[in-house]
Interface confidence: low
């Protein structure tokens, strides 16, 4: 009696179970009563990442430099190419089909985590005692100058965007 279901890594066709092609290979012809499934390796620019009955391999992803993309990992017959973004850019999505510039942290904020090819800059507000007066994708919040260690006194308090202003101690006592 013809099977109604097949084992793992097999598929049902013409009332019989044929072996699937292994990853990295595509189907050329189904098995028959007398012959095995015929499979062929994918070409250099193609891949298939599962046991399959595909008659065409998938093209490797193209990391398009005009969209700021570059190859992070070259594809094989069993894996797709992995793209990442060029210096100064990061992916807009997990599949990394396009890139956008890293954002800068505005004055009053410092860099908590520098951007990578796949993630944007993470900024954090400068806490009391720290400041940032620049828009930067690299600089952390900096501590206020310690006037005391320079034998000076605070003439103007610092903010999250400005350093303290130090001045000479009042000599008149």
């Amino acid at each position: 009696e013809p099977p109604t279901a097949c084992r793992e890594k097999q598929y049902l066709i013409n009332s019989q179970c044929c072996s699937l092609c292994q990853p990295g290979q595509k189907l050329v012809s189904d098995c028959t009563e007398f012959t095995e499934t015929e499979c062929l390796p994918c070409s250099e620019s193609e891949f298939l990442d599962t046991w399959n009955r595909e008659t065409r391999c998938h093209q490797h992803k193209y990391c398009d430099p005009n969209l700021g993309l570059q190859v992070q990992q070259k594809g094989t017959s069993e894996t797709d190419t992995i793209c990442t973004c060029e210096e100064g850019l990061h992916c807009t999505s997990e599949s990394c089909e396009s890139c956008v510039p890293h954002r800068s942290c505005l004055p009053g904020f410092g860099v908590k985590q520098i951007a990578t090819g796949v993630s944007d800059t993470i900024c954090e507000p400068c806490p009391v005692g720290f400041f940032s007066n620049v828009s930067s994708a690299f600089e952390k919040c900096r501590p206020w100058t310690s006037c005391e260690t320079k034998d000076l006194v605070v003439q103007q308090a610092g903010t999250n965007k400005t350093d303290v202003v130090c001045g000479p101690q009042d000599r008149q006592r």
Partner: antibody
């Protein structure tokens, strides 16, 4: 100035292949990204895909099995083929240029109406 | 895919009025949004790119702004030639997606 001009049959029978060509002047199809977009009766616009300066293509997932975008650099044209069409593919088809993110889609063709009917 | 929710879908206004159309993106699109205009004749014209940059040759009464994932097109003083359909387009992530459109009619 950059100009794009769509051309092709205005009437296609169901199950047949819709074929359109976009002729580009004032720029080369060997630079930038050349896109197809369609507008259905009513207001809905749908992005279909592109062919890039290098010849690589991107197709919107819902059309992947039916769409082919190609180019002819000698004629400075790029083309759209959409197979197995139905009445739901009746739309105005636009070609458009995209070069830089800062500029977005900066030039559009005037559009051509394709009706799918027997 | 990124969904673009545009409102209103239709509105009527008078010459000289200030008009605002908004689009909200379902995900972060990093400012990569265009506003386009389609006249009754069918031709499409880019008005704004990168959320707030006025395209060359477009009158200064058109402006675009962004607040997070919400984008706004403003026409400061409507002119007779501005009555048309308007769409937002996100081009941050493939497939690019459009808002549902706003039909701007004469009151």
């Amino acid at each position: 100035e950059v100009q794009l001009q769509e051309s092709g049959p205005g009437l296609v029978k169901p199950s047949q292949t819709l074929s359109l060509t976009c002729t580009v002047s004032g720029d080369s199809v060997s630079s930038g990204y050349w896109n197809w977009i369609r507008k259905f009766p009513g207001k809905k616009l749908e992005y279909m895909g592109f062919i890039s300066y290098s010849g690589s293509t991107y197709y919107t997932p819902s059309l992947k099995s039916r769409i082919t975008i190609s180019r002819d650099t000698s004629k400075n044209q790029f083309s759209l083929k959409l197979s197995s069409v139905t009445a739901a593919d009746t739309a105005v088809y636009f070609c458009a240029r995209f070069r830089r993110y800062d500029d977005g889609v900066d030039y559009w063709g005037q559009g051509t109406l394709v009706t799918v009917s027997s | 895919d990124i969904q673009m929710t545009q409102s209103p879908s239709a509105m009527s206004a008078s010459v000289g009025d200030r008009v605002t159309i908004t689009c909200r993106a379902s995900h972060e699109i990093s400012g990569y949004l265009s506003w386009i205009q389609q006249k009754p004749g069918g031709t499409i014209k880019r008005l704004i790119n990168a959320a707030s940059t006025l395209a060359s040759g477009v009158p200064s009464r058109f402006s675009g702004s962004r607040s997070g994932t919400e984008f706004t097109l403003t026409i400061s003083s409507l002119q007779p030639e501005d009555f048309a359909d308007y769409y937002c387009l996100q081009y941050s992530s493939y497939p690019w997606t459009f808002g549902g459109g706003t039909k701007l009619e004469i009151k």
